[in-house]
């Protein structure tokens, strides 16, 4: 190698600007004894470069860019070799910018899965390699006292989101939880939440039904539908409130929300519902009065609201 | 301290009825589930019924539908089994407890011995 | 129903003793398993809830691993107090079942 190249730094803060030398050395006989260096930045040649020869006789040149204004590009210095440029050496150089806080940090307990899982918002491009980690401690107290560290959560590249499994987890402590964003720029931490899982456990909905007919009860009134639901079972100890959403299946209008129900009831009888009317149906459910996240609404039932009250047979359009 | 004290067992003839009571205290008694489990002498454990925090869901072991009818009574912090039309095969140690969120049964009661015999 | 099967049956080790019970559902319950220590004339004891939650107050010697089907209680350095019965218990649906217990005797 007749050249070599040595940068200020190969990453800087977009704009910034960036030294950069180019020693030759003297044992390349084959070149001119006082070559002119000559500098590229991508394809674009670049004036400035101030060279001298140093007392061992390698030829050295100075060059500095007053804005690195492109996130990625190659810089290359070389000499005039006949009709064509040779490169002696070329580096690459990064620009951009320190990771910004995360954000947003939000968790959720999936009971099903068993693990905790977090996400948050990255915050602006940084235009570099950034790393995430989703970093954690179980706690006595109020997270003011650190107990044991969790292993490291690293999530897959380009996800904003990390599972934390069951067995780094104890339900009905606090954790202290945070996510660490790092460059070559610098570091940045979220701040912290101290949650216990329990709290921001997030529970499977119910599943609707269309309620029995049974001789001995009462037909529903014209405009009313019976609905009954079948509560997820894993999340049958936890205290929850419901909520059910109800639209006619032809026309724009939006979901009208009835709720909350009442603490377990399994069934309900819909009133105010337009006769002769095809309704879609669904409920969702969030442990309460402990804290928690609401599930996410239940598949759609369908159910026709009567004519008038039937005088003999009762019949259920169910999907 | 959580604290649950079953009474209301003892010798019963078969097709006889008998009501357990299991006082609780030291928690709120109407925000938990609470659950009975009986141990046959000799046997291992046996989940007999449950009961919702407001007392509107009550699962049975299909061995006691029927026969048996789990209540409570939120102002009196008392859980009860109503046991009817009993069997030999229903001698046991009933303890009551208090069912944690998902499914666990802490604390238990010292137990209470129902004996079905002739 | 689910049915829970442990092994073995019974056990016979020495103080100091690391001691591995075994429970197994007959379908899928997440981590929706608990284990019991019952000394005899006595009530059960929950140790361990949701598959590897340490209940409070119960040593760290006790713990608890597994999911899906495949459950384990670890007593990694077993000392007089622990000679007992061992139950799992399954609360995923109902019923809520037992699995058949492990009597731990002293060697």
């Known amino acids: 190698e007749c050249g070599h190249i040595s940068v200020s730094a190969p990453i800087v803060h977009l704009g910034d600007p960036i030294t950069a030398s180019c020693i030759i050395k003297q044992n390349c006989s084959h070149l001119d004894p006082e070559p002119q260096i000559l500098w590229r930045l991508g394809a674009e040649l670049q004036p400035g470069g101030r060279q001298q020869r140093l007392s061992d006789g390698t030829q050295e040149s100075i060059i500095t860019l007053p804005h690195l204004n492109h996130t990625q590009a190659f810089l290359s210095c070389a000499l005039n070799w006949g009709n064509s440029l040779q490169i002696l050496d070329q580096v690459e150089l990064r620009a951009g910018y320190p990771p910004a806080i995360p954000h947003n940090l939000s968790c959720l307990m999936n009971l099903t899965t068993s693990s905790l899982i977090c996400q948050w918002e990255p915050g602006p491009e940084t235009h570099l390699p950034t790393s995430f980690t989703l970093k954690s401690f179980k706690s006595r107290g109020n997270c003011q006292t650190q107990g044991d560290s969790i292993l490291d959560c690293v999530p897959k590249d380009g996800q904003s989101h990390c599972s934390i499994p069951r067995k780094h987890l104890l339900l009905y402590q606090n954790m202290g939880i945070w996510v660490q964003a790092e460059n070559a720029l610098g570091t940045s931490m979220s701040p912290q939440l101290c949650l216990d899982p329990m709290d921001v456990v997030k529970l499977e909905p119910p599943m609707l039904r269309t309620m029995d007919p049974s001789p001995e009860a009462a037909p529903p009134q014209a405009g009313c539908l019976q609905l009954s639901w079948e509560p997820w079972q894993p999340g049958l100890h936890i205290n929850q409130k419901c909520e059910l959403r109800h639209k006619p299946q032809r026309g724009e209008a939006s979901w009208a929300l009835v709720g909350p129900l009442p603490l377990e009831a399994l069934q309900y009888e819909l009133c105010g519902l337009l006769p002769a009317t095809a309704y879609t149906l669904q409920i969702r459910c969030i442990r309460w009065p402990l804290p928690g996240h609401w599930s996410d609404w239940s598949p759609s039932l369908e159910l026709r609201t009567t004519e008038r009250a039937p005088t003999h047979h009762h019949h259920h359009h169910h999907h | 301290e959580v604290q649950l004290l079953e009474s209301g067992g003892g010798l019963v003839q078969p097709g006889g009825s008998l009501r357990l009571s299991c006082a609780a205290s030291g928690f709120t008694f109407s925000l938990y589930w609470m659950g009975w489990v009986r141990q046959a002498p000799g046997k291992g454990l046996e989940w007999v019924s449950s009961?919702?925090?407001?007392?509107?869901?009550?699962p049975y072991a299909d061995s006691v539908k029927g026969r048996f009818t789990i209540s409570r009574d939120n102002s009196k912090n008392t859980l009860y089994l109503q046991m009817n039309s009993l069997r030999a095969e229903d001698t046991a140690v009933y303890y009551c407890?208090?069912?944690?969120?998902?499914?666990?049964?802490?604390?238990w009661g010292q137990g209470t011995l129902v004996t079905v015999s002739s | 129903d689910i049915q829970m099967t442990q092994s073995p049956s019974s056990l016979s080790a020495s103080v100091g003793d690391r001691v591995t019970i075994t429970c197994r559902a007959s379908?899928?319950?997440?981590?929706?398993l608990n284990w019991y220590q019952q000394k005899p004339g006595k009530a059960p004891k929950l140790l361990i809830y949701?598959?590897?939650n340490l209940q409070n107050g119960v040593p760290s010697r006790f713990s608890g691993s597994g999911s899906g089907t495949d459950f384990t209680l670890t007593i990694s350095s077993l000392q007089p107090e622990d000679f007992a019965t061992y139950y799992c218990e399954q609360g995923w649906n109902y019923p809520l079942t037992f699995g058949g217990g492990t009597k731990v005797e002293i060697k």
């Open positions: 009961i919702s925090s407001s007392g509107g869901v009550t």
């Open positions: 407890a208090k069912l944690g969120e998902l499914g666990w049964f802490d604390p």
């Open positions: 379908q899928g319950i997440s981590s929706y």
């Open positions: 949701y598959a590897s």
